[in-house]
C-alpha cells in the first residue's frame, strides 16, 4: 500500500494506491483512492507512467479529457466515472500488454488540495493449474497443466504423506510456447504416485503463485486449485 500526500500551497490530500499485476491479453485494474470531494467538477484525476511523455488518462470537470493521452493507451483506459465522487480514481486497462509494466502515478486535485501516489504494475501471464490422473501412462501418473504463464515459472510437486520429499527425480516439466509467442503452456508429470494421498503441483513466477491439489483414493478423486498474486503492496 502506498500512501502519498500533496506538497502544494493548498492542503495535501491522501492518495492511496496498491501495487498489482496484470495478466497479459486480459483487462487490468490500477487501484487508486483519495479523500473524496463533494463536487465532481472540482476533481481532477491524472494517471501518468514513468518514461511515457503523454498522459495515461485524465478525468476533469466530470468527464474524460484525453487530448494529451499517449498513443500506447488510446482506446484502452477508463475510470469508473460514477465512483469518482466517492474517491475512487482506479483505472481500467484493456488488453494488458507486457509493455504496460512500470511505475504509474495517480495524481489527484480536489478543492481540498493535491496529492499523489505511485504504483508498481507488473505484467505477465498466470493461470490456474489442473491436475488429473494420467490413465494413458504405464504406471500411476499425475499430469498438471496450466495454459498460460510468463515469465517461465518453476514447478514443484509436494505430497501430504511425504512432507518435505523432493519429487524432482520422479517428475518431468515442459514448457510449450503458445501461438502468440509470449506465454507458455506448462505441463508437469509426476510418476510413481501412491493412492490415499494428496499431491500438490505448485507453479510460481515473480508475479503469481498457483497450486493445483489432487486427492486420490480408491473410491474417488478430489481436485482443488487456487491462484495468488504476489507483491500486492499498498502505497
Amino acid at each position: 500500500l502506498i500512501i502519498g500526500f500533496g506538497i502544494s500551497g493548498r492542503h495535501s490530500i491522501t492518495v492511496t494506491t496498491v501495487a498489482s499485476a496484470g495478466n497479459i491479453g486480459e483487462d487490468g485494474i490500477l487501484s487508486c483512492t483519495f479523500e473524496p470531494d463533494i463536487k465532481l467538477s472540482d476533481i481532477v484525476i491524472q494517471w501518468l507512467k514513468e518514461g511515457v511523455i503523454g498522459l495515461v488518462h485524465e478525468f476533469k470537470e466530470g468527464k474524460d479529457e484525453l487530448s494529451e493521452q499517449d498513443e500506447m493507451f488510446r482506446g484502452r483506459t477508463a475510470v469508473f466515472a460514477d465512483q469518482v465522487i466517492v474517491g475512487n480514481a482506479s483505472l481500467r486497462l484493456k488488453n494488458v500488454q507486457l509493455t504496460d509494466a512500470g511505475t504509474y502515478k495517480c495524481y489527484i486535485i480536489t478543492s481540498k488540495g493535491k496529492g499523489n501516489a505511485n504504483l508498481e504494475y507488473k505484467t505477465g501471464a498466470f493461470s490456474m493449474p489442473e491436475v488429473n490422473v494420467d490413465y494413458n501412462a504405464s504406471s500411476e501418473t499425475l499430469r498438471c497443466e496450466a495454459p498460460r504463464w510468463f515469465p517461465q515459472p518453476t514447478v514443484v510437486w509436494a505430497s501430504q504423506v511425504d512432507q518435505g520429499a523432493n519429487f524432482s527425480e520422479v517428475s518431468n516439466t515442459s514448457f510449450e510456447l503458445n501461438s502468440e509467442n509470449v506465454t507458455m503452456k506448462v505441463v508437469s508429470v509426476l510418476y510413481n504416485v501412491t493412492i490415499n494421498n494428496t499431491y500438490s503441483c505448485m507453479i510460481e513466477n515473480d508475479i503469481a503463485k498457483a497450486t493445483g491439489d489432487i486427492k486420490v483414493t480408491e473410491s474417488e478423486i478430489k481436485r482443488r486449485s487456487h491462484l495468488q498474486l504476489l507483491n500486492s503492496k499498498a502505497s
Epitope: 491479453g25 484525453l66 487530448s67 484502452r76 488488453n95
Partner: antibody, heavy 119, light 107 residues
Framework: QIQLQESGPGLVQPSQSLSITCTVS????????VQWVRQSPGKGLEWLGV???????DYNAAFISRLSISKDNSKSQVFFKMNSLQADDTAIYYC?????????????WGQGTLVTVSS | NIVMTQSPKSMSMSVGERVTLSCKAS??????VSWYQQKPEQSPKLLIY???NRYTGVPDRFTGSGSATDFTLTISSVQAEDLADYHC?????????FGSGTKLEIK
Amino acid sequence: QIQLQESGPGLVQPSQSLSITCTVSGFSLTSYGVQWVRQSPGKGLEWLGVIWSGGSTDYNAAFISRLSISKDNSKSQVFFKMNSLQADDTAIYYCARDISTIVEGFAHWGQGTLVTVSS
Amino acid sequence: NIVMTQSPKSMSMSVGERVTLSCKASEKVGTYVSWYQQKPEQSPKLLIYGASNRYTGVPDRFTGSGSATDFTLTISSVQAEDLADYHCGQSYRYPFTFGSGTKLEIK
C-alpha cells in the same frame, strides 16, 4: 443528447476521392474517439479506421494507403478522406462513437451517407 | 485479422419463440464482443457490449453470453419488431471486425 451526422457527396467518379464530414454534438472530440465503418449493399459491416481524442489515428491495413482521417475539435467535426475509389467502394459510410473511452461497442451512430461510385 | 463467423445466415421465427444467434471468433477476443441490431433502412443499434452487458434502453429479452471465441445472442421471446439483421463485432484487436450478419424474419 449525443448525435453524429455525416455529410457526403452521394456520387463519386471512379478513381476520384471521397470526402465525408462527421459533425458531432453532445460530447467532446477531446474525450472520445470517432470510428468509421462502411456497409456495402447486401454485405456486412467493415471497420475502416478511427481518430482518437489526441488526434492520432488507426486504420484498417486494407485501406491504409488511401485513407486519412482528421478533425477540428473546436468545430466538433471529423473529416474522412478516401482516395482512388472504385465501384466496390460503393457503400453506406457511417461515423460512430464508442460506449466509453475503452473501445467495447459502438453505441452512437450517424445516419450514414450513401456513396455510389459510378461514371 | 480476426474472423467473426455468424450462424445461421437467416432464420424465420414465430412471435414468442426463443431465438439463439451464434458468433464465433477465429482467435480469443476475451469479452470484447458487441451485438448490433439493424432494421431495414436504419443505422445499426448497439444491443450488447462486453459480450454480456445490455446497453441502455435495450429490452431485457435480449441477452448476450460467451467469452474467448464462442458468443451467443439470445432473444427469449421474439417480437414482431425484432425483424432485423443482427451483427456481432470484436473490438479486442485491430482491425476491428464484424460478422456477416444473421437475418431474422418473423413468420
